[in-house]
């Protein structure tokens, strides 16, 4: 079964700087990745970035830089808002559309006890959907 993992990382150097890492574990080829915050895409979440493996990337504030890390993983750096931990209690969701599996989505957030530089464990949280 395909799986999506989400890591939310606070940068050690800047406590207000966050990066979301997402990856797809499955045999299919990825056709689109959507990153949202505040909930899953289309279910109360607000779209932060859309990454297409050939067409390119689109992003919206507070996203600063969305990019592919590998053929099956992406990272999204978030804008430094000036607050100490603006995204500390926020849920980030990544939806991977792949062929022929369909869409798989998982969400994650920064663990409350996280030290700067540490990240959430790379396992899907309960919100895992196959469309």
């Amino acid at each position: 079964t395909p799986e999506v993992w989400v890591q939310v990382q606070m940068e050690a150097t800047e406590l207000s700087s966050f990066t979301v890492h997402c990856g797809f574990l499955g045999p299919g080829s990825i056709s689109l990745v959507t990153v949202s915050w505040g909930g899953p895409d289309g279910a109360g979440g607000t779209k932060l970035a859309v990454l297409h493996p050939e067409l390119g990337t689109r992003q919206w504030a507070p996203a600063r830089q969305a990019r592919w890390e590998t053929q099956s993983s992406i990272s999204l750096a978030l804008e430094d808002s000036g607050a100490s931990s603006p995204f500390a209690n926020t849920t980030f969701c990544c939806k991977f559309a792949s062929f022929p599996e369909g869409s798989w989505e998982s969400c994650g957030s920064l663990p409350p006890s996280s030290d700067p530089g540490l990240s959430a464990p790379p396992t899907p949280v309960p919100i895992l959907r196959a469309d």
Partner: antibody
Framework: QVQLQQSGAELVRPGASVTLSCKAS????????MHWVKQTPVHGLEWIGA????????AYNQKFKGKAILTADKSSSTAYMELRSLTSEDSAVYYC????????????????WGQGTTLTVSS | DIVMTQSQKFMSTSVGDRVSITCKAS??????VAWYQQKPGQSPKALIY???NRHTGVPDRFTGSGSGTDFTLTISNVQSEDLADYFC?????????FGAGTKLELK
């Protein structure tokens, strides 16, 4: 037919602010992002940022963060760009241009542009 | 930021000639490149999208090619109305960036 009608030329003083407008017609305003581009003889074409009229979501080139503020009014199908704390470096032609939002159509590009607004900042 | 380099600022040609305008990206942008034509006092007009697809109504003498880092806009059988500035644009990553432009002029 698709038209992006931009506001007229502006002559403003340094330190002031100005709001440029771009009225869209001939298509569904919320189906396309509106992007803004600056053109000068020295720096050529520079992407300023974009707004999704449907959600109000914005994206900015870091270079123009704090300089430009993008908004959109769905009821009048008009996009706006406010430029703040103007200096002579902001003198340029500014274009609005639309970008299709769907990836299904695989039409990723600026297909139509406004006629441009010339901004002159001078005392 | 991704830099789009159009190494030739000017290109001289004659009516009926074939001319190739190049654009090089500082990193792999797949096929996320578009080409625009701009005549003096006018706004840019779309020619090519996704490296090789012609925009609606663009004559077939305009051809785009390339992927990765190297892209080419070829105009075969150049017409007098083709004398203009040509810009490439990458949309692989934000911020979107343009080439500095290549001016096509008569010999």
């Amino acid at each position: 037919q698709v038209q992006l009608q931009q506001s007229g030329a502006e002559l403003v003083r340094p330190g002031a602010s100005v709001t440029l407008s771009c009225k869209a017609s001939g298509y569904t305003f919320t189906d396309y992002e509106m992007h803004w581009v600056k053109q000068t003889p020295v720096h050529g074409l520079e992407w300023i940022g974009a707004i999704d009229p449907e959600t109000g979501g914005t994206a900015y080139n870091q270079k123009f963060k704090g300089k430009a503020i993008l908004t959109a009014d769905k009821s009048s199908s008009t996009a706006y760009m406010e430029l703040r704390s103007l200096t002579s470096e902001d003198s340029a032609v500014y274009y609005c241009t639309r970008w299709i939002t769907t990836v299904v159509a695989t039409l990723y590009y600026f297909d139509y542009w406004g006629q441009g607004t010339t901004l002159t900042v001078s005392s | 930021d991704i830099v789009m380099t159009q190494s030739q600022k000017f290109m001289s040609t004659s009516v009926g000639d074939r001319v190739s305008i190049t654009c090089k990206a500082s990193q792999n942008v797949r096929t996320a490149v578009a080409w625009y034509q701009q005549k003096p006092g006018q706004s840019p007009k779309a020619l090519i999208y996704l490296a090789s697809n012609r925009h609606t109504g663009v004559p077939d003498r305009f051809t785009g090619s390339g992927s990765g880092t190297d892209f080419t806009l070829t105009i075969s059988n150049v017409q007098s109305e083709d004398l203009a500035d040509y810009f490439c644009l990458q949309h692989w990553n934000y911020p979107l960036t343009f080439g500095a432009g290549t001016k096509l002029e008569l010999k």
